[in-house]
């Protein structure tokens, strides 16, 4: 004969465990039903009655099958340097990630504890490695024949336009200026951008920074100490 299916609550056989989505209640000494995600145990089981579950209240959640007496509180609202990438529901906690232009310098189990603004590359320098969710921007000097005239965390060095006749030669922070005759090859207008970190790319993107009005001779200055390598701000 096939074994009978026991309905909760039931006393487990000695040495056996309760089935999936059940738990052993020490007080009742019975296998009882767990509550589904989005619910919690309102009344624990007894020898004769199963667990009574109830829905989580607003701003609380349970993500797993459980028998907790109270749902967990969702995390606080996302801060001004973050965007909400997962809303607080009865079944999941809110997740905040750093907004565009920022990276997570200190992670927590889900989301980010502390966001920091990405470094920017000054005129004469372009982005060598873009910022990611968890790493800062790395800049590099623009090589001969390329330039960047912006202070930006996304702009890379781009080629000088090639002129028939050069009026002003380009340098690391300025494009070449051609005489009134049109250049033989002109780059597409506007700066070349690197994408923002994937998780926030579609969220609240900010306008492209305008070119800095600072003098564009910074690349001529003697180089100071090397900037920290990517990731060196982490512990």
């Amino acid at each position: 004969l096939p074994a009978q299916v026991a309905f909760t609550p039931y006393a487990p056989e000695p040495g056996s465990t309760c089935r999936l989505r059940e738990y052993y209640d020490q007080t009742a000494q019975m296998c009882c039903s767990k509550c589904s995600p989005g619910q919690h145990a309102k009344v624990f089981c007894t020898k004769t009655s199963d667990t009574v579950c109830d829905s989580c209240e607003d701003s609380t959640y349970t993500q797993l099958w459980n028998w907790v007496p109270e749902c967990l509180s969702c995390g606080s609202r996302c801060s001004s340097d973050q965007v909400e990438t997962q809303a607080c529901t009865r079944e999941q906690n809110r997740i905040c990630t750093c907004r565009p232009g920022w990276y997570c310098a200190l992670s927590k189990q889900e989301g980010c504890r502390l966001c920091a603004p990405l470094r920017k590359c000054r005129p004469g320098f372009g982005v060598a490695r873009p910022g990611t969710e968890t790493s800062d921007v790395v800049c590099k000097p623009c090589a001969p024949g390329t330039f960047s005239n912006t202070t930006s965390s996304t702009d890379i060095c781009r080629p000088h336009q090639i002129c028939n006749v050069v009026a002003i030669p380009g340098n690391a922070s300025m494009d070449a200026v051609c005489t009134s005759t049109s250049p033989t090859r002109s780059m597409a207008p506007g700066a070349v951008h690197l994408p923002q970190p994937v998780s926030t790319r579609s969220q609240h993107t900010q306008p492209t920074p305008e070119p800095s009005t600072a003098p564009s001779t910074s690349f001529l200055l003697p180089m100071g100490p090397s900037p920290p390598a990517e990731g060196s701000t982490g512990d």
Epitope: S79, S80, D81, Q82, G101, A105, L106, R113, L114, C115, A116, P117, L118, R119, K120, C121, R122, G124, F125, C139, K140, P141, T151, S152, Q206, P207, P209, E210, P211, S212, T213, A214, S218, F219, M223, G224, P225, S226, P227, P228, S232, T233, G234, D235
Partner: antibody, heavy 121, light 110 residues
Framework: QSVEESGGRLVTPGTPLTLTCTVS????????INWVRQAPGKGLEWIGI?????ITNFANWAKGRFTISKTSTTVDLKIASPTTEDTATYFC??????????????????WGPGTLVTVSS | ALVMTQTPASVEADVGGTVTINCQAS??????LAWYQQKPGQRPKLLIY???ILTSGVSSRFKGSGSGTEYTLTINGVQCADAATYYC????????????FGGGTEVVVK
């Protein structure tokens, strides 16, 4: 590249006051601006920041007491209802130190000379 | 709230001596820490950023170190011109910040 505060004066408690930070040599669409104050004989106290995109954030104690706004070349700090405890020198400071091809937005440089606000009845 | 605790509040040093100022964050700040010098009646001056990088024009007698929650400013070969108040500052201006600055340390040179 410089910043300079103005608008500091003697006011009576409860009289709204607006301080202005005027920037030159750089763009407010590239750099954040912080407001910091220093009561006589006391330490530096961060009030808040306006980011390049116009978003503002404030120290816990300053929320609701101050607002920050900006134009293309100025940043205003409004003290909604000053009390005698708001007597201090108010500084604006750019969020962003330029070095080695980088702008480090977490360091404050340059600073303005400060403007003195005295709140007294 | 993220809080910076700076010690000592005041320190005396002999010319040529060494001064050590400590700054403790209530949680890790991942090296996003700066040090400032302020003399009476003047604006603060940035000395060190990212915990250990000296700004241009600042004497190599100043040294920043530390990581995680513990940071230190060391002034070697103290000179009379070093008499000032020094402040640490963390680089987070997001939510739940009480003050980005430590309480300050007054350095008195004898």
């Amino acid at each position: 590249q410089s910043v300079e505060e103005s608008g500091g004066r003697l006011v009576t408690p409860g009289t709204p006051l607006t301080l202005t930070c005027t920037v030159s040599g750089f763009s407010l669409s590239t750099y954040d601006i912080n407001w910091v104050r220093q009561a006589p004989g006391k330490g530096l106290e961060w009030i808040g920041i306006i980011y390049t995109g116009g978003i503002t954030n404030f120290a816990n104690w300053a929320k609701g007491r101050f607002t920050i706004s900006k134009t293309s070349t100025t940043v205003d700090l409004k003290i909604a209802s000053p009390t005698t405890e708001d007597t201090a020198t108010y500084f604006c400071a750019r969020g962003g130190y330029d070095s080695d091809g980088y702008v480090y937005p977490d360091a404050f440089d340059p600073w303005g000379p400060g403007t003195l606000v005295t709140v007294s009845s | 709230a993220l809080v910076m605790t700076q010690t000592p509040a005041s320190v005396e040093a002999d010319v040529g001596g060494t001064v050590t100022i400590n700054c403790q964050a209530s949680e890790s700040i991942s090296n996003l820490l700066a040090w400032y010098q302020q003399k009476p009646g003047q604006r603060p001056k940035l000395l060190i950023y990212r915990a250990s990088i000296l700004t241009s024009g600042v004497s190599s007698r100043f040294k920043g170190s530390g990581s995680g929650t513990e940071y230190t400013l060391t002034i070697n070969g103290v000179q009379c011109a070093d008499a000032a108040t020094y402040y640490c500052q963390h680089g987070y201006t997001g939510t739940n910040v009480q003050n980005v600055f430590g309480g300050g340390t007054e350095v008195v040179v004898k």
